[in-house]
């Protein structure tokens, strides 16, 4: 707390400007109106404040707005945002999306904080669904930020705005989020002829079923081994050699370096060695011929 | 490409005066504050004097008050601090450089830097 | 605010993680900046709040802390590296910088 001092002689501020620079706290404290601060919060920013000076700013707008700060003042905040808490933003009500971008450029170059998290999360909130625009914007600022919402809040993301992802938004995503975004994905590009769709769909291929990458494999789509590697399992086992073999194409050489590796390893495991053969890589560890393969769980269904 | 120039350094006697200029370039000088910044010979950095992009604010280290004058002008790229009654503890190398912007938020660092003016003060 | 660097010089190899500290007299909230200076040379911008790059500086370059104590890390040491660090608080006026941390070559 700043101690209640009066305000010396002839340092009464009458607008926000340079000649604020070397007033002391308790200066600040008594010489700065509260309402004339919070009308020139545009002029904050052009001034370079220590953060001490803005601690007692933040001081005043907190006492001249207990239940919250209204947009027109938190649009202007700048660096005064970096001290305002989770619990100061909750109490915010941010609908434009230009006080969004205005805030994440001054946290520009930090980690996403909690402040900042809770500012999305509020404006999203506020919103009733992840738009493009927004998405857009955030993915902008923080490439991971898709891959921090839960399954749940994906589910709120509009089909539309799978337009506004990039392959590196998704690179952190685990395959319960993939589950998710792959059928807006398949949904949004829908539209988009074989090697266009193929180049969009990629990077969720990681939430594609078996049916999916089948129909893939008819389409001389060449698939690289790094996005074969982050595929569902469960959706590789069901494909045959030759359908592995179609949807790589020319990287279907890379099977050999990765054999030890999932889904690899557990594909060949499912495949008759016979037909492993084929592909002349030197894969081992396919079902030896003469074997018979029960699909138990095939079996279990029918009962 | 932002570019500071100091010039106006030399030896002085103890007492002396002197006028050292920085010429800005590369960037929008009136926009930015501008700084004086020295370094004693194998010392550390002291923060002399600072103006303000207007020029109508003004500091000084309590070793330079009364002494050191800054100032500005924006209309020439131009800043200047007039050194008087030069001491032997003046002796440094003198930077200009200009305060951090990254539109439209400001903060006290100095982002530019010149190569720097020696000042010897010496008998 | 006094700044207090640690240690004022060190000896190290390329391809060495290197860590210098500053200390502040009192809080300083996150209202730390680290420049290096090269013999001969300016000082240049490598760190402000803290933990912040300043643009086009390599991210082998890091630092942490909040208050009273701050870390400069060069995760591995470079030829290019090898310098004069300083920090410098911009909590409250008059700004002032820390005394120094010469990194040589070993």
């Known amino acids: 707390e700043v101690e209640k001092t009066a305000c010396p002689s002839g340092k009464k501020a009458r607008e926000i400007d340079e000649s604020l620079i070397f007033y002391k706290k308790w200066e600040l404290e008594a010489c700065v109106d509260a309402a004339l601060l919070a009308t020139q919060m545009d002029r904050v920013n052009a001034i370079p404040f220590t953060y001490e000076q803005l601690d007692v700013l933040k001081h005043k707008l907190d006492e001249l707005y207990p239940q919250g700060y209204p947009e027109s003042v938190i649009q202007h905040l700048g660096y005064l945002f970096l001290k305002m808490s989770p619990e100061d933003i909750r109490k915010w009500n941010v609908t434009s999306l230009e006080t969004l971008k205005a805030l994440l450029e001054v946290n520009k170059g930090h980690e996403m904080s909690p402040q900042v998290a809770t500012l999305i999360d509020r404006f999203v909130k506020g919103r009733g669904q992840l738009d493009k625009d927004t998405l857009d914007t955030l993915t902008a600022f923080y490439p991971g930020y898709l891959c921090s919402l839960s399954p749940e809040e994906l589910s709120s993301v509009p089909p539309s705005s799978i337009w506004a992802v990039r392959p590196q938004d998704l690179d952190t995503c685990d395959p319960r989020q993939l589950d998710v975004l792959y059928p807006k994905a398949r949904l949004a590009f829908q539209n988009m002829n074989g090697s266009e769709y193929f180049v969009k769909i990629q990077s969720f291929l990681g939430g594609a079923p078996t049916e999916d990458l089948k129909a893939l494999s008819q389409q001389n789509v060449s698939m690289d081994l790094a996005t074969f590697m982050k595929l569902r399992t469960d959706a590789v086992l069901p494909l045959t050699v030759a359908e592995v073999q179609k949807l790589l194409g020319p990287h279907v050489e890379g099977l050999k370096a990765e054999e030890r590796h999932r889904p690899v390893r557990d594909w060949i495991l499912r495949q008759r060695q016979d037909d492993l053969d084929t592909l002349g890589l030197g894969l081992q560890g396919g079902i030896p011929n003469g074997y018979l393969v029960l699909d138990l769980s095939m079996q279990e269904a029918l009962s | 490409q932002v570019q500071l120039v100091e010039s106006g350094g030399g030896l002085v006697k103890p007492g002396g005066s002197l006028r050292l200029s920085c010429a800005a370039s590369?960037?929008?000088?009136?926009?930015?504050?501008m700084s004086w910044i020295r370094q004693a010979p194998g010392k550390g950095l002291e923060w002399v004097s600072y103006?303000?992009?207007?020029?109508?604010?003004?500091y000084y280290a309590d070793s330079v008050k009364g002494r050191f004058t800054i100032s500005r002008d924006n209309a020439k790229n131009s800043l200047y601090l007039q050194m008087n009654s030069l001491r032997a503890e003046d002796t440094a190398v003198y930077y200009c450089?200009?305060?951090?912007?990254?539109?439209?938020?400001?903060?006290?660092?100095?982002?530019?830097w010149g190569q720097g003016t020696l000042v010897t003060v010496s008998s | 605010i006094q700044l207090t660097q640690s240690p004022s010089s060190l000896s190290a190899s390329v391809g060495d993680r290197v860590t210098i500290t500053c200390r502040a007299s009192?809080?300083?909230?996150?209202?730390l900046a680290w420049y290096q200076q090269k013999p001969g040379k300016a000082p240049k911008l490598l760190i402000y709040?803290?933990?912040s790059l300043e643009s086009g500086v390599p991210s082998r370059f890091s630092g942490s802390g909040s208050g009273t104590d701050f870390t400069l890390t060069i995760s591995s040491l470079q030829p290019e590296d090898f310098a004069t660090y300083y920090c410098?608080?911009?909590?409250?006026?008059?700004?002032?910088f820390g005394g120094g941390t010469k990194v040589e070559i070993k």
């Open positions: 410098q608080q911009f909590n409250s006026y008059p700004l002032t």
């Open positions: 709040d803290a933990s």
């Open positions: 590369g960037f929008t000088f009136s926009d930015y504050y």
């Open positions: 103006i303000s992009s207007s020029g109508s604010t003004i």
């Open positions: 450089a200009s305060g951090w912007i990254r539109v439209p938020l400001r903060l006290p660092l100095f982002q530019h």
């Open positions: 009192q809080g300083i909230s996150s209202a």
